[in-house]
């Protein structure tokens, strides 16, 4: 058993049918010695008396808010949460496995640049009685500071019969140098509590590996005289690290017909312009990627050919 | 420690071309190592990230773009700083800093070259003959060093008398390649920046 926060305790249980559970001793936070009784949650049934209460915690029915009283007055509370260990593996019931980029990916994180700011998000089908708390650091043995905000509900989606809820959090490394070569990964730890179930999820990454630039901005077309060709031009996104000659991007320009089946023409360039043939009803899209370290491509920025 | 003073090549930047080749070569070699050594801990998540140039060179600091010298976090570990008393940088100071930057890159390349050659000698003794260093990568390191045009003492290739532990050697190869790829990215950024300046 360990303390999650004041008066909230997590009991770790080896979770299998007929498991003996864990013996827990609760102590009433009071100078009083006599006439103390204990109850669980809203029930008025007296579970025991005395300054301490010994309980065998086996299932969720044994968890909850234990209260000690004296003469009708509440003295203190202890909330017990359960953390299930199933055959050596901590349970992951609360969050959905996003399966990208690999199985057992519960937290996904992205950064728009090298400033040390990043966003993480996760999915759940649970809509109520749910709280999250996020901590982060650079490295784990001698951790350096990363400050995270509060997790907020950022999207709701309907997936078949189920509703899916997306939560996200923004974090910022306290003293980040965009040019630094990372040798210690960022660690992100999310505590999740659903009703009386506690779970924790972690992710470890280098900022360089989670970079996903914003799409190029000011995408424009300039027709070339007496030709079906157009000059496409664009600019680096505002959110990208500067100077751009040091933090350079590379670009992919795509000409896509109205039908998804039509052949796509693609050009790769390090410049911020390209000459392409504009077909009728087609659209031109451009996306960006770090020129030197191949992390994710940005989303496409698009303009119609007409 | 005195870094050799550079005479930066006036036509800046055959170096840019060579640094791009270097990044391509080390990335290919790392990919090959990850595939060949699939049963070894060779991914970024599995290895310890070590920098053999730590405390010996200061490439990131010496080659920091002017625009980032205002960022306190980038100056924390700097022995040399771009910042001068005035609001502008004297051109003499700039060329000195550039020389310091390029000589630091040269020292990095020299250190990695020695490590890779020593390692290759060990890998050639492996009866499994599982993986060797790409000669193209070693050649590209050499070409960039020549383009940087520095003279410094040659570092003798390390020779070891004891029987090599091939498992450890292969894990060390992964660690070296990951670190060298990160340094190659920095070198490429620096060359691109200097080329634009």
């Amino acid at each position: 058993i360990w303390e999650l926060k004041k008066d909230v305790y997590v009991v770790e249980l080896d979770w299998y049918p007929d498991a003996p559970g864990e013996m827990v001793v609760l102590t009433c936070d009071t100078p009083e010695e006599d006439g103390i009784t204990w109850t669980l949650d809203q029930s008025s049934e007296v579970l025991g008396s005395g300054k301490t209460l010994t309980i065998q915690v086996k299932e969720f029915g044994d968890a909850g808010q234990y209260t000690c009283h004296k003469g009708g007055e509440v003295l203190s509370h202890s909330l017990l949460l359960l953390h299930k260990k199933e055959d050596g593996i901590w349970s992951t019931d609360i969050l959905k496995d996003q399966k990208e980029p690999k199985n057992k990916t519960f937290l996904r994180c992205e950064a728009k640049n090298y400033s040390g700011r990043f966003t993480c998000w996760w999915l759940t089908t649970i809509s109520t009685d749910l709280t999250f708390s996020v901590k982060s650091s650079r490295g784990s043995s001698d951790p350096q500071g990363v400050t995270c905000g509060a997790a907020t509900l950022s999207a709701e989606r309907v997936r078949g019969d189920n509703k899916e809820y997306e939560y996200s959090v923004e974090c910022q490394e306290d003293s980040a140098c965009p040019a630094a070569e990372e040798s210690l990964p960022i660690e992100v730890m999310v505590d999740a509590v659903h009703k009386l179930k506690y779970e924790n999820y972690t992710s470890s990454f280098f900022i360089r590996d989670i970079i996903k630039p914003d799409p190029p901005k000011n995408l424009q077309l300039k027709p070339l005289k007496n030709s079906r060709q157009v000059e496409v031009s664009w600019e680096y996104p505002d959110t990208w690290s500067t100077p751009h000659s040091y933090f350079s991007l590379t670009f992919c320009v795509q000409v896509q017909g109205k039908s998804k089946r039509e052949k796509k023409d693609r050009v790769f360039t390090d410049k911020t312009s390209a000459t392409v043939i504009c077909r009728k009803n087609a659209s031109i899209s451009v996306r960006a990627q770090d020129r030197y370290y191949s992390s994710s491509w940005s989303e496409w920025a698009s303009v119609p050919c007409s | 420690r005195n870094l050799p003073v550079a005479t930066p090549d006036p036509g800046m930047f055959p170096c840019l071309h060579h640094s791009q080749n270097l990044l391509r070569a080390v990335s290919n070699m790392l990919q090959k190592a990850r595939q060949t050594l699939e049963f070894y801990p060779c991914t970024s998540e599995e290895i310890d990230h070590e920098d053999i140039t730590k405390d010996k060179t200061s490439t990131v600091e010496a080659c920091l773009p002017l625009e980032l010298t205002k960022n306190e976090s980038c100056l924390n570990s700097r022995e040399t700083s771009f910042i001068t008393n005035g609001s502008c940088l004297a051109s003499r100071k700039t060329s000195f800093m550039m020389a310091l930057c390029l000589s630091s890159i040269y020292e990095d390349l020299k250190m990695y070259q020695v490590e890779f050659k020593t390692m290759n000698a060990k890998l050639l003794m492996d009866p499994k003959r599982q993986i060797f260093l790409d000669q193209n990568m070693l050649a590209v390191i050499d070409e960039l060093m020549q383009a940087l045009n520095f003279n410094s003492e040659t570092v003798p290739q390390k020779s070891s008398l004891e029987e090599p532990d091939f498992y450890k050697t292969k894990i060390k190869l992964c660690i070296l390649l990951h670190a060298f790829r990160i340094r190659a990215v920095t070198i490429d950024r620096v060359m691109s920046y200097l080329n634009a300046s």
Partner: antibody, heavy 115, light 111 residues
Framework: QVQLVQSGGGVVQPGRSLRLSCAAS????????MHWVRQAPGKGLEWVAF????????YYADSVKGRFTISRDNSKNTLYLQMKSLRAEDTAVYYC????????WGQGTMVTVSS | SYVLTQPPSVSGTPGQRVTISCSGG????????VKWYQQLPGTAPKLLIY???QRPSGVPDRFSGSKSGTSASLAITGVQAEDEADYYC????????????FGTGTKVTVL
């Protein structure tokens, strides 16, 4: 105490279907994940499928993916394995087991796929 | 399906020490706990060891388990005639409850 009683095995022709059941008692069935494991005659144990305590997630071995469906009815304390497009290589004793460090196994039920 | 490798058979005389190896990889034994089962002919497997080296109550202390890196082993110190059976190791792939992996099985013969 914990008991898992299996039923539904038998002889079936290739391409046909069969549904196995596993009735649980002596524990809170709805709180625990469940597996199906099989053993071909004279061969070793092979994991087949797993279902979470609430039925929200199901996982399958590649050899049965798309043909077998694991399901549960927590109100009836019963685990199921629906087997379709059966093949000769599916011939085995099928066991249901609880998930956890101390697992409990059913008695096994024989499925024979033969023409 | 993923398979953990065990020797097909091992044998020993009563009172001898018998060990069975179970070899896996980084994604299964290397990152998860190991269990061992004993299976007597015509019966369901019985749990002998969980959590690499833990014995459930009722399992004789002559059975012991250990794990090192990507391999595990089961030792029977002072093997007895009633220990003649098939033995299987089991783990999970990539810390994933939905992918239980078993060993190929070892027949223990008491001479």
């Amino acid at each position: 105490q914990v008991q898992l009683v299996q039923s539904g095995g038998g002889v079936v022709q290739p391409g046909r279907s069969l549904r196995l059941s596993c009735a649980a008692s002596g524990f809170t069935f709805s709180s625990y994940g469940m597996h199906w494991v099989r053993q071909a005659p004279g061969k070793g144990l092979e994991w087949v499928a797993f279902i979470r305590y609430d039925g929200s997630n199901k996982y399958y071995a590649d050899s049965v993916k798309g043909r077998f469906t694991i399901s549960r009815d927590n109100s009836k304390n019963t685990l199921y394995l629906q087997m379709k497009s059966l093949r000769a290589e599916d011939t085995a004793v099928y066991y249901c087991t609880t998930h956890g460090s101390h697992d409990n196994w059913g008695q096994g039920t024989m499925v024979t796929v033969s023409s | 399906s993923y398979v953990l490798t065990q020797p097909p058979s091992v044998s020993g005389t009563p009172g001898q020490r018998v060990t069975i190896s179970c070899s896996g990889g980084r994604s299964n034994i290397g990152s998860n706990t190991v269990k061992w089962y004993q299976q007597l002919p015509g019966t369901a497997p019985k749990l002998l060891i969980y959590g690499n080296d833990q014995r459930p109550s009722g399992v004789p202390d002559r059975f012991s388990g250990s794990k090192s890196g990507t391999s595990a082993s089961l030792a029977i110190t002072g093997v007895q005639a009633e220990d003649e059976a098939d033995y299987y190791c089991q783990s999970y792939d990539r810390g994933f409850t939905g992918s239980r992996v078993f060993g190929t099985g070892t027949k223990v013969t008491v001479l």
